[in-house]
Interface confidence: low
């Protein structure tokens, strides 16, 4: 059969009827249905969601959908103990104290089971001590405090401000720092956007809100007492003192009213510049400790939240493929939330509903995908990526031999200003032809293409005419596939304006406030972006899953390859005597980029030659395609980070969220100049080079012709 | 209120087996990680065994490791610590005791009365 | 064998005032909690001070607990009859993984 026998109708037709079946007014609906009550991670509310979204999935015609779980580590806040932070006198009474929970909005003043603000993982503890801002709790941030201003934070209760980089990162540079403790709160400068109204009347922060989130520095491990295994039921957990990530400091967020009253305070050292100081009517002094009259108040924790062995579960759809039922296209995006999960994942969830629905009617008229296409809901993902990782880790010999691609679908907004998309090179070329065919819902381009307002908007810093793709860091679901695996990843969401909205995040994220009413009053009234958000991720999948050749083109990976090495060499090039004195040289890695980028090139050629007809010649194609993004995988992994094995991409080691290329070598040539044995870490350095070359010239040695 | 009431005390020859059980009432006890505390005629307190909340997370003193099995049933609100090779040391009134935190003991914020274990021959 | 320490016995006067010491380490009281029981002739132990320093509900303010690097401290004052029992601190003990409890210490109120 030939694969449009096989599919039944001509590929563009699916495609059209595909997109046409997505309605705004059902992602609506779902979204709804979805966050009315809270689905935190390993509650029962989260496990009657699952069975009612496998129950929904299996009526909108999936071949099958089943329930996988693990008993993976949750942390809780104690229900009778709470946390909360004070400020102690001299006798140490406790003259103030954090607020206990945020203020419910209105009409859900009576739901139950909202989990209070906490940091996930946080260690029990109650320490005292003089507090010190550290700004953003950044790698530099640290640099300048101990460094420049000489302030040591050992023994001190640090207090930090959210924005930037992924909490977690924070909390392991405060307890390098020697902090005994860890505030995080949300400034108004970073949470707050000028002229906007709070939460009800508008989408920003309210002084009582609270980002919650986790603490971990999991890098990839999943599940903290079973890395690199499935957390099953004859699963070897490792003990609490020897489990992957956890924080060894009490840690606890707050909001911008209970900061004001722990900075208003603050004495020691005047901030050192404007970038330090935020938006509240405090000096933003740096400490350590309070200034004269309260110079003997100290600041004290009380953190009692508790980690617990907790049975998770994900819901995976699969709709088998027509010719080739051994190659998968995932999509996958969370389910739980921390509370009502308006945006984060509901947003995407609903989305991913609409999705299989959609895929469900086409099948319900007999039509398959050419390649099987799996549909995941994940739990525990606010814990750590867990539920996805765990999956992975279950499955990963048939995802490394069969996996074709994942999509990623959290939160479908973070913004309504124009689209935001990160992924895999070899993706570039599908988006982009993708969002040419879909229309744009923005204002003011009416019955233009998705393509033209994104380009407009956000224009790509490298190549003009092009919108902007971002690298793929981490902190989502996808981590595992593309950072672990191998496979070929993906996200899309729209975002909000980055030049004017200098808040990091959106301002109610992960707080009580992210309600279905946020997004239907002030994001997206019609769900006209939910409905591009699905658009585009459902169009990805379809093509992933449908396309005779693999939408992937390897030539974007050579151009990027070439980019990274240059920045890589500029790095390095800031220590000309040293690369000297230690013979370094990134020739070879140039070398190897240029290889490949012939290698590409005359791949793709055949590629677009070769008889497609021919099902053992595609099937060779295809196939060189999809192991492509394997081949940049390093079995050894990097450097004390065995879980993130792409050596053109991992997580920055100072921010989970932000994707770092040639990360070995980054890393390797990171503040070498403070390093104690400089013939040491410039051997590294080179040893990293010597890598990132090999592995690029072994992914090129894939594309070439196999006899 | 809280209560917690212990039973299956009683004597046993050295090298027998007893098994004690702790109803517990009053609180959601599949919330709260619960230990069994000994108390030795005329000594002081030992603690013995704590079963977490939620997971079923174990942990022994050294003096009954691989001797004692501490286990819960969340659905009937009882807490077990299963006594194999009992000594004559073992004799002791064993407390149930609720965990005011949760996961690990924590402090013990209610007792049971206490069920007495006799090891003699 | 107990890792926590305290005086077998105190004792004073009824209106006076008694402290406890309970001595550890770094592994246990150093970086833990500590909490304090009160087991009155016959009974069960029953929580009278918990976090160190805090009392529960019920629990009359003229006991009080503090703690100080590696050792503890219970305080009574305004000494009872109906004070005289067993008294014992607590605490988790990190290197251990287990729950250690104090020797224990007697009050005994004179005359």
């Known amino acids: 059969k030939s694969s449009s026998e096989a599919t039944n109708i001509t590929p563009k037709h699916n495609m059209k009827a595909f997109l046409d079946e997505l309605k705004a007014e059902n992602i609506k609906k779902f979204l709804h249905n979805f966050t009315q009550i809270p689905h935190l991670a390993g509650t029962e509310q989260n496990f009657q969601l699952a069975k009612q979204i496998q129950s929904q999935w299996k009526e909108f015609g999936l071949d099958s959908v089943e329930l996988t779980h693990y008993d993976v580590l949750l942390s809780y806040p104690n229900k009778t103990h709470p946390n909360y932070i004070s400020i102690i006198n001299e006798d140490g009474n406790e003259i103030f104290n954090t607020s206990l929970f945020e203020p419910p909005p209105a009409g859900y003043e009576n739901v139950s089971d909202i989990v209070p603000p906490f940091s996930a993982f946080s260690p029990q503890g109650m320490p005292e001590g003089d507090l010190v801002y550290v700004n953003y709790a950044r790698t530099e941030d640290f640099f300048k405090l101990e460094r420049d201003m000489k302030i040591n934070c050992s023994g001190k209760i640090v207090i930090a401000r959210y924005g930037k980089v992924f909490r977690g990162n924070k909390v392991k540079n405060a307890q390098l720092a020697g902090a005994t403790g860890v505030i995080l709160y949300s400034d108004p400068d970073d949470y707050f956007a000028p002229g906007v109204k709070s939460y009800p009347d508008g989408w920003n922060l309210p002084g009582g809100g609270v980002q919650r989130g986790n603490i971990l520095n999991l890098n990839g491990a999943g599940d903290p007492l079973t890395p690199g295994y499935p957390a099953n039921e004859y699963a070897y957990r490792r003990g609490m003192a020897e489990a992957v990530g956890l924080p060894s400091i009490p840690v606890h967020p707050i909001g911008y009213y209970d900061a004001q009253k722990l900075l208003e305070k603050m004495g020691g050292s005047a901030s050192p510049d404007s970038s330090w100081r935020g938006s509240l009517k405090v000096p933003y002094n740096v400490g350590p400790g309070f200034t004269g009259n309260f110079s003997t108040q100290k600041v004290k924790m009380h953190i009692h939240s508790t980690s617990e062995v907790t049975r998770i579960y994900n819901v995976i759809g699969t709709l088998r493929g027509a010719v080739e039922p051994d190659r998968y296209v995932i999509l996958g995006g969370h389910r739980d939330s921390w509370v009502f999960g308006g945006i984060d994942p509901q947003s995407g969830a609903a989305v991913v509903h609409e999705i299989v629905r959609s895929f469900g009617m086409l099948k319900k008229e007999g039509w398959r995908p050419r390649r099987t296409i799996l549909f995941a809901s994940w739990d525990a993902e606010e814990f750590g990526l867990l539920g996805s990782t765990e999956w992975a880790e279950e499955n990963s010999r048939l995802l490394q031999e069969r996996g074709v691609a994942y999509i990623n679908a959290d939160s479908s907004i973070e913004g309504n200003y124009t689209l935001r998309v990160d992924c895999t090179p070899l993706m570039y070329s599908l988006v982009y032809n993708l969002t040419k065919e879909l229309e744009s819902p923005d204002e003011g381009f009416e019955g233009k293409s998705l393509y033209e307002s994104w380009t407009k908007k956000s224009p790509s810093p490298e190549f003009s005419g092009m919108p902007r793709i971002s690298k793929l860091g981490s902190g989502n679901d996808f981590e595992v596939f593309f950072q672990r695996l191998g496979i070929a990843s993906g996200r899309a969401r729209y975002t909000k304006n980055w030049e004017t909205n200098k808040f990091s995040s959106y301002p109610l994220y992960h707080s009580v406030y992210e309600t279905y009413e946020l997004v239907e009053k002030f994001y997206d009234p019609m769900f006209k972006y939910h409905l591009t958000v699905a658009q585009v991720r459902g169009g990805m999948v379809f093509e992933l899953a449908n396309s005779v050749v693999l939408p992937f083109d390897c030539r974007d990976y050579a151009v990027v390859l070439r980019k990274y090495a240059d920045k890589i060499y500029n790095i390095s090039m800031k220590h000309p005597q040293e690369m000297k004195t230690y013979s370094v040289s990134f020739d070879s890695l140039f070398s190897a980029v240029k290889n490949f980028t012939e290698i590409a090139s005359k791949f793709s050629e055949r590629l677009r030659d070769f008889d497609k007809s021919n099902p053992i010649l595609l099937r060779m194609m295809n196939d060189q395609l999809m192991f492509l993004e394997r081949a940049f995988i390093d079995p050894l992994g990097l450097p004390d980070r065995p879980f993130y094995r792409h050596v053109i991409y991992a997580p920055s080691s100072h921010n989970k969220y932000a994707g770092e290329s040639f990360p070995g070598i980054y890393d390797a040539l990171f503040d070498i100049e403070s390093k104690v044995d400089p013939s040491q870490a410039w051997g590294e350095v080179k040893r990293q080079i010597s890598i990132a070359t090999f592995t690029v010239q072994a992914a090129a040695e894939t594309l070439s012709e196999v006899a | 209120e809280v209560q917690l009431v212990e039973s299956g005390g009683g004597l046993v020859q050295p090298g027998g087996s007893l098994r004690l059980s702790c109803a517990a009432s009053?609180?959601?006890?599949?919330?709260?990680?619960m230990s069994w505390v000994r108390q030795a005629p005329g000594k002081g307190l030992e603690w013995v065994s704590a079963i977490s909340g939620g997971s079923g997370s174990t942990y022994y003193a050294d003096s009954v490791k691989g001797r004692f099995t501490i286990s819960r049933d969340n659905s009937k609100n009882t807490l077990y610590l299963q006594m194999n090779s009992l000594r004559a040391e073992d004799s002791a009134v064993y407390y149930c005791?609720?965990?005011?935190?949760?996961?690990?003991?924590?402090?013990?914020?209610?007792w049971g009365q206490g069920t007495l274990v006799t090891v003699s021959s | 064998q107990s890792v926590l320490t305290q005086p077998p016995s105190v004792s004073a006067a009824p209106g006076q005032k008694v402290t406890i010491s309970c001595s550890g380490s770094?592994?246990?009281?150093?970086?833990?909690?500590v909490s304090w029981y009160q087991q009155l002739p016959g009974t069960a132990p029953k929580l009278l001070i918990y976090?160190?320093?805090k009392r529960p509900s019920g629990i009359p303010d003229r006991f009080s607990g503090s703690k100080s690097g590696t050792s503890a401290t219970l305080g009574i004052t305004g000494l009872q009859t109906g004070d005289e029992a067993d008294y014992y601190c607590?605490?988790?003990?990190?290197?251990?993984?287990?729950?250690?409890f104090g020797t224990g210490t007697k009050v005994t109120v004179l005359g």
């Open positions: 976090d160190n320093n």
């Open positions: 009053g609180f959601t006890f599949s919330s709260y990680a």
């Open positions: 607590g605490t988790w003990d990190s290197s251990l993984s287990a729950y250690v």
């Open positions: 005791a609720k965990d005011g935190v949760g996961a690990t003991p924590y402090y013990f914020d209610y």
């Open positions: 770094s592994s246990n009281i150093g970086n833990n909690y």
